[in-house]
Interface confidence: low
């Protein structure tokens, strides 16, 4: 019988008392085969973190800063359940750390040096860790002790809880730096009052502070937010203008064998029985013998954290960067205009080989980072382990939802002004063998399908989106008798046709022979009835253009396209017989690396782009023997996006809508995780 006990960690006598009450009340409402609570008492949160890591306890609720500590080795804990606040109808699991200024003050985020600052308190998330972490690399050397560097950066401050004797400038705006509400400038409201009174020029608070302190919109309109891109926005636009998005209070558990499903089952049942306004006898979100015992008193309930989320992703790139700067004394970017090397994310072995060759040829401008799947790469770009990669439109959508931005587009047509003219896109097509003459778009049920990969544009999002509109359910593995759609569940019929060996079977990378455009076409040639690819795939792999044994004798005339009206046409008539127009692949990065990625890639393509005529003796960025490694092999250049610089603008309304409709069929654990942070 599996042990269904969750050992909760308590950090004080009062918490231990509440924990025992929690345990006893859960026993009274949950059947004996359900989850139960046991209580473990430790002296501090850090002791609880260590106890969970050592398997002496299972769960504890932590503030954001401690979630970061819990995540660090050797603890390796992960967030599993989030408290939410506000109403059930609009539950808030995060708050936004913001920099508030007066409307007429005229400076930006990059002009804070010499200004007067108001902080909620030394060492607090929104008031200190985040702003100072983000400003860390602008602080004057030496940066240690940190308080001295901050004192020398601003012309005066109020940082409650600082040592006024050693660092008097930090207490200049609030003599004594009192660490309680006796100091009128202490805490969120105090820091805002410090700005309002004219003592300071900027207040570092959370997004709700200004609304809690100024009920009148006309009064709020006298203030603005400083954004990280050195612009300002109105105070109600905090979702698009904040320093970091910070989780409020989170239950953590072990990453491996952490009982996360059991913890959720326990807390979900607990909130049903003892949540807000549920029971008089015991209340989960109330602390008669103290404040915020086990859970915050202001919490309204729990939400399950998506399993794909580790602490870094949960906390978010901005917050992790801020904390790491303070803890490790490292700067995330060079403080000059010079760009650091771009860390390119390479998928599996084949891409890594090409990337390493690129890195050597770039003389230090490009470095390589490996991952096994596209989603793993996107996650690494999000958390700063990598910087950029080129993605199919389906993954541009996921990357965009995860906060990344497109920076350059692959162009596939030769033109005089390639780099200045991003193309409208390519065509997604359905290819069949000419010999299967009875096959049409209308009778694909029960046939064998070949896809580039789950989540990709031509191979999945477009054909499956069209199919979904016909069948109105997500069970595509029942619609086709079998197929190869790399990235599907391994036991799915959509992995049955795949050719990868062992663990590589159906993997969404080049270790699976039927992955990508060429792989999906090969799947059709060898096993399938229909392949969902791009309009250039057939000509690129027939007529001797692909020398691989499976392709060298293929003839374009032996294949036809399925049209949506139920007819078929020759391959060259793709313009009148396609499923949809697909956005070109694009390079994505984090917003903070956008300028450098743009600059370095444009230099790189001038050196190694399609102007290189002999690829046998020289490195060619856009060549890999039809394997589409790092970039599509038919890329002519990487083009500027001009104003199409967000994922919505780049992909276009129609495609975003199509992928949005397919969201309910999404198998993307990353998309699930990213929409938790920003729905």
């Amino acid at each position: 019988v599996p042990d269904k006990t969750v050992r909760w960690c308590a950090v004080s006598e009062h918490e231990a008392t509440k924990c025992q009450s929690f345990r006893d009340h859960m026993k009274s409402v949950i059947p004996s085969d359900g989850p139960s609570v046991a209580c473990v008492k430790k002296a501090s949160y850090l002791d609880c973190i260590r106890a969970i890591a050592a398997n002496e306890a299972d769960a504890v609720t932590l503030d954001a800063g401690l979630v970061y500590d819990a995540y660090l080795a050797p603890n390796n804990l992960k967030p599993v359940v989030a408290e939410f606040y506000g109403s059930k109808e609009d539950p808030q699991t995060f708050y936004y750390a913001v920099a508030v200024v007066k409307k007429d003050s005229g400076f930006q985020m990059n002009q804070l040096r010499g200004k007067k600052s108001c902080h909620t308190g030394l060492g607090r998330s929104a008031g200190w860790n985040i702003p100072i972490g983000l400003l860390y690399c602008d602080l004057p050397e030496p940066r240690k002790p940190l308080e001295k560097a901050v004192a020398n950066f601003f012309s005066g401050s109020c940082a409650p809880c600082a040592d006024g004797t050693d660092f008097p400038q930090l207490c200049q705006l609030c003599p004594g730096c009192g660490c309680s509400t006796l100091n009128q400038y202490f805490g969120y409201s105090g820091a805002f009052k410090c700005l309002k009174d004219g003592a300071g020029d900027v207040a570092f608070v959370k997004h709700s502070t200004i609304f809690e302190n100024l009920a009148n919109k006309a009064d709020r309109d006298q203030y603005e937010l400083l954004c990280l891109d050195n612009t300002r926005k109105p105070v109600d636009e905090y979702k698009d203008c904040h320093l970091a998005q910070v989780p409020s209070h989170t239950v953590v558990a072990r990453s491996m064998g952490g009982k996360e499903d059991l913890i959720w089952e326990l807390l979900n049942q607990a909130q049903e029985h003892f949540g807000k306004d549920k029971s008089k006898e015991f209340q989960l979100f109330s602390s008669p013998h103290g404040k915020d015992l086990l859970f915050k008193d202001s919490a309204h309930g729990f939400l399950k954290v998506p399993p794909r989320m580790d602490a870094k992703m949960y906390l978010g790139y901005e917050y992790v960067t801020a904390i790491r700067n303070l803890r490790e004394g490292t700067c995330p970017e060079a403080p000059t205009d010079e760009c650091k090397p771009v860390k390119w994310c390479a998928l599996s072995h084949h891409e890594r080989l090409k990337c390493d060759e690129w890195s050597v040829n770039s003389v230090g401008k490009i470095e390589c980072v490996s991952a096994e799947t596209t989603e793993d790469c996107i996650a690494k770009i999000m958390n700063g382990e990598a910087d950029a990669m080129s993605l199919d439109g389906g993954f541009v959508y996921i990357a965009g939802k995860c906060g990344l931005v497109p920076v350059l587009a692959e162009n596939y047509n030769k033109s005089d002004n390639c780099e200045d003219t991003p193309e409208a896109g390519y065509f997604a097509i359905a290819v069949v063998k000419k010999s299967a003459s009875d096959l049409t778009w209308d009778n694909l049920k029960g046939k064998k399908s070949c896809h580039t990969a789950v989540g990709r544009t031509a191979g999945w999002n477009i054909p499956m989106g069209l199919l979904y509109n016909k069948i109105n359910h997500c069970r595509f593995d029942e619609f086709f008798s079998e197929g190869c759609a790399p990235g599907s569940k391994k036991d799915s019929s959509l992995c049955k046709l795949c050719m990868g060996s062992g663990l590589n079977l159906c993997e969404p990378n080049n270790k699976e022979g039927y992955y990508g455009y060429t792989g999906a076409f090969r799947c059709l040639v060898e096993k399938g009835d229909v392949a969902f690819v791009k309009h250039q795939t057939v000509p690129q792999n027939t007529g001797g253009k692909n020398p691989d044994p499976w392709a060298k004798n293929l003839n374009e005339k032996d294949y036809e396209l399925l049209c949506l009206d139920g007819t078929r046409k020759p391959v060259e008539e793709y313009a009148n017989c396609h499923l949809a127009r697909a956005p070109n692949h694009a390079v994505v990065t984090r917003k903070d690396k956008e300028a450098c990625v743009h600059k370095i890639l444009r230099q790189q393509q001038h050196l190694f782009g399609s102007n290189v005529t002999d690829c046998s003796g020289n490195f060619c960025l856009f060549r890999s023997e039809t394997k589409d490694l790092l970039f599509r092999d038919d890329t002519v250049c990487l083009a500027k996006l001009h104003d199409r610089n967000t994922y919505e603008k780049y992909l276009g309304e129609e495609y975003v809508k199509a992928v949005g409709n397919l969201r309910k069929c999404s198998t993307s654990s990353l998309l699930e995780a990213c929409t938790f942070r920003r729905p």
Partner: nanobody, 124 residues
Framework: QVKLEESGGGLVQAGGSLRLSCEAS????????MGWFRQAPGKERELVAG???????NYADSVKGRFTISRDNAQNTMYLQMNSLRPEDTAAYSC??????????????????WGQGTQVTVSS
């Protein structure tokens, strides 16, 4: 958890109109899309219309031009305005909500929620 409650069904003459409502409660924050399904006796359940939180919609061919789906996010309510009703529209209509981390290929319904259903009968 998400709870869904339908209302508005009933008996109506062919050519008449009805408006169905579906009110969501609970963790409504997690909802990515909602839909109306129907099942006539002896037939498979079919999607009538669907709407995402962003407002994009899709309809079954048989109801296009006659039915309109809409959503009031502030009230956590979805509506189905049914005009020019036909006898073949007679069925039990159910409201469906899918959360943002739902539905793997092959169909895990762990985060898919259904209402109890409301009967619509169209007499000729």
């Amino acid at each position: 958890q998400v709870k869904l409650e339908e209302s508005g069904g009933g008996l109506v003459q062919a050519g008449g109109s009805l408006r169905l409502s579906c009110e969501a409660s609970g963790n409504v924050f997690t909802i990515a899309a909602m839909g109306w399904f129907r099942q006539a006796p002896g037939k498979e359940r079919e999607l009538v219309a669907g709407i995402t939180t962003g407002g994009s919609t899709n309809y079954a061919d048989s109801v296009k031009g006659r039915f309109t789906i809409s959503r009031d996010n502030a009230q956590n309510t979805m509506y189905l305005q049914m005009n020019s009703l036909r006898p073949e529209d007679t069925a039990a209509y159910s409201c469906n909500a899918v959360t943002k981390w739902a539905a793997r290929v092959g169909g895990s319904a762990e985060y898919e929620y259904w209402g109890q259903g409301t009967q619509v009968t169209v007499s000729s």
